[in-house]
């Protein structure tokens, strides 16, 4: 990473308005199929990708207002094995439904300390945060 | 989103050192199987998730030094259909290999304009950026 400043002053610089997130308004991201209720282990013939997958999954919210992005979603597999392409319901033990992980760049809001130890606004601290993105139907590992 | 400042001054506030990304050093994320060479349409019995998947994919780098994260990776499907769980090589026309998309929060470095139009450091502009995360084996849509 190149050196980008990570600290922002707390008071009116350059103006309160500019200190808002200066973007085209974007709604908080909600996966199309955010479903916290029980979902059966089956592959649908319609609906979003995560319900049509033969390794179906649901999304769970991870919210931290001191982090950017504030809302992240973690995938949770609904089946241990893959669902048969033929029936869409019976599981096929020849395939495993595995979580795909990703280390996402996030930023945490932290207090900034001035030269004399006094607080000077806050810092944005870059971190890698592990999220599960999806469930993938894979062939089981064959140990050598 | 709650209101977080998005602008940072350009000169020594609170100090040059503090203005560096104040984190534990993290190497740029490289998926384990970043492979830009031709890969056959088959599901491996070992290796990383994207090569063992019956909807295998490779990663392509997307680099922008004025963006955080600077490096993003896009998945590219290696097969139009899913690979048979039985053979790991023949395609099964009953399943499609589809890209899973995600609108990721990214930040762009933009000049900040002061009250008199002069530049006051830069702003971090939040945007949603579409990335393909993986390829998923799905049952084809059945149109009603």
């Amino acid at each position: 990473y190149s050196h980008w400043p990570s600290c922002c002053p707390s008071k009116g610089y350059p103006s309160e308005e500019l200190l808002r997130w200066s973007t085209v308004p974007v709604p908080p991201l909600k996966p199309a199929s955010l479903d916290f209720h029980s979902v059966s282990c089956r592959a649908s013939e319609d609906g979003p990708l995560n319900s049509r997958a033969i390794s179906p999954w649901r999304y769970e919210l991870d919210r931290d207002l001191n982090r950017l992005p504030q809302d992240l979603y973690h995938a949770r597999c609904l089946c241990p094995h893959c669902v048969s392409l033929q029936t869409g319901s019976h599981m096929d033990p020849r395939g495993n439904s595995e979580l795909l992980y990703h280390n996402q760049t996030v930023f945490y809001r932290r207090p900034c300390h001035g030269k004399k130890g006094n607080h000077k606004g806050y810092c944005l601290e870059r971190r890698l945060y592990r999220v599960s993105l999806a469930c993938v139907c894979v062939r089981p590992r064959v140990m050598g | 989103y709650s209101h977080w400042p998005s602008c940072c001054p350009s000169k020594g506030y609170p100090s040059e050192e503090l203005l560096r990304w104040s984190t534990v050093p993290v190497p740029p994320l490289k998926p384990a199987s970043l492979d830009f060479h031709s890969v056959s349409c088959r599901a491996s019995e070992d290796g990383p998730l994207n090569s063992r998947a019956i909807s295998p994919w490779r990663y392509e780098l997307d680099r922008d030094l004025n963006r955080l994260p600077q490096d993003l990776y896009h998945a590219r499907c290696l097969c139009p259909h899913c690979v048979s769980l039985q053979t790991g090589s023949h395609m099964d026309p009953r399943g499609n290999s589809e890209l899973l998309y995600h609108n990721q929060t990214v930040f762009y470095r933009r000049p900040c304009h002061g009250k008199k139009g002069n530049h006051k450091g830069y702003c971090l502009e939040r945007r949603l950026y579409r990335v393909s995360l993986a390829c998923v084996c799905v049952r084809p849509r059945v149109m009603g």
Epitope: E60, L61, R63, L65, N66, D71, H74, P111 | Y1, S2
Partner: antibody, heavy 125, light 108 residues
Framework: QVTLKESGPTLVKPTQTLTLTCTFS??????????LGWIRQPPGKALEWLAH???????HYKPALKSRLTITKDTSKNQVVLTMTNVDPVDTATYYC?????????????????WGQGTLVTVSS | DIQLTQSPSFLSASVGDRVTITCSAS?????MYWYQQKPGKAPKPLIY???NLASGVPSRFSGSGSGTEYTLTISSMQPEDFATYYC???????????FGQGTKLEIK
């Protein structure tokens, strides 16, 4: 100033549904970052968080009680309602509603900064 | 779920004593919050974000800690400090608020 007040039945029979209302003033639950939660305390025991609702209508529940709880808000009435189905004598407790929404120079606080006085609910036949 | 364990559960102290209450989390957390509760009353916030005093809280109260171990310290006990103290954390995934089991401070 900020005030919160819980209301609801003092006595509920087992298997019935308990409905509690939190009426608040001095803040708006439509303000970004604002949230309101329910906490209970059985007699002589510790505090137990039950449910939370955010300004944007995102809801969280204690996993062990998720199937029995529903939290809703009516921003125009300044009210948050908690319903608990299939109550049992072990649900006997003082139920509190509490606000969360403090943004300091160092960030957002996940502490409940204002609490109602609590309402004692007894579950008994 | 992250578990919080407070120790001790009961503590007898005298006016003027220095008292320390600890709160251990089952896995690492970013911040801890502390409350004081008196009989028949709602809890009152004492410490925000590990070490920041809530409004109106006397400076004899302080908080510290990181990772899995956090402490609340009362430098010199006063008669009005005899109460039950609770630690609390927020976990972002799944979003949950967790309280410790409480520490009851009694007069010796």
């Amino acid at each position: 100033q900020v005030t919160l007040k819980e209301s609801g039945p003092t006595l509920v029979k087992p298997t019935q549904t308990l409905t509690l209302t939190c009426t608040f003033s001095g803040f708006s639950l439509s303000t970004s970052g604002m949230g309101l939660g329910w906490i209970r305390q059985p007699p002589g025991k510790a505090l137990e968080w039950l449910a939370h609702i955010w300004w944007d209508d995102v809801k969280h529940y204690k996993p062990a009680l998720k199937s029995r709880l529903t939290i809703t808000k009516d921003t125009s009435k300044n009210q948050v309602v908690l319903t608990m189905t299939n109550v049992d004598p072990v649900d006997t407790a003082t139920y509190y509603c509490a606000r969360m929404g403090q943004l300091h120079y160092y960030g957002y606080d996940y502490a409940m900064d204002y609490w109602g006085q609590g309402t004692l609910v007894t579950v008994s036949s | 779920d992250i578990q919080l364990t407070q120790s001790p559960s009961f503590l007898s102290a005298s006016v003027g004593d220095r008292v320390t209450i600890t709160c251990s989390a089952s896995s690492s957390v970013s911040y801890m919050y502390w409350y004081q509760q008196k009989p028949g009353k709602a809890p009152k916030p004492l410490i925000y974000r590990t070490s920041n005093l809530a409004s109106g809280v006397p400076s004899r109260f302080s908080g510290s800690g990181s990772g899995t171990e956090y402490t609340l310290t009362i430098s010199s006990m006063q008669p009005e400090d005899f109460a039950t103290y609770y630690c609390q954390l927020y976990h972002s995934y799944p979003p949950t608020w967790t309280f410790g089991q409480g520490t009851k401070l009694e007069i010796k």
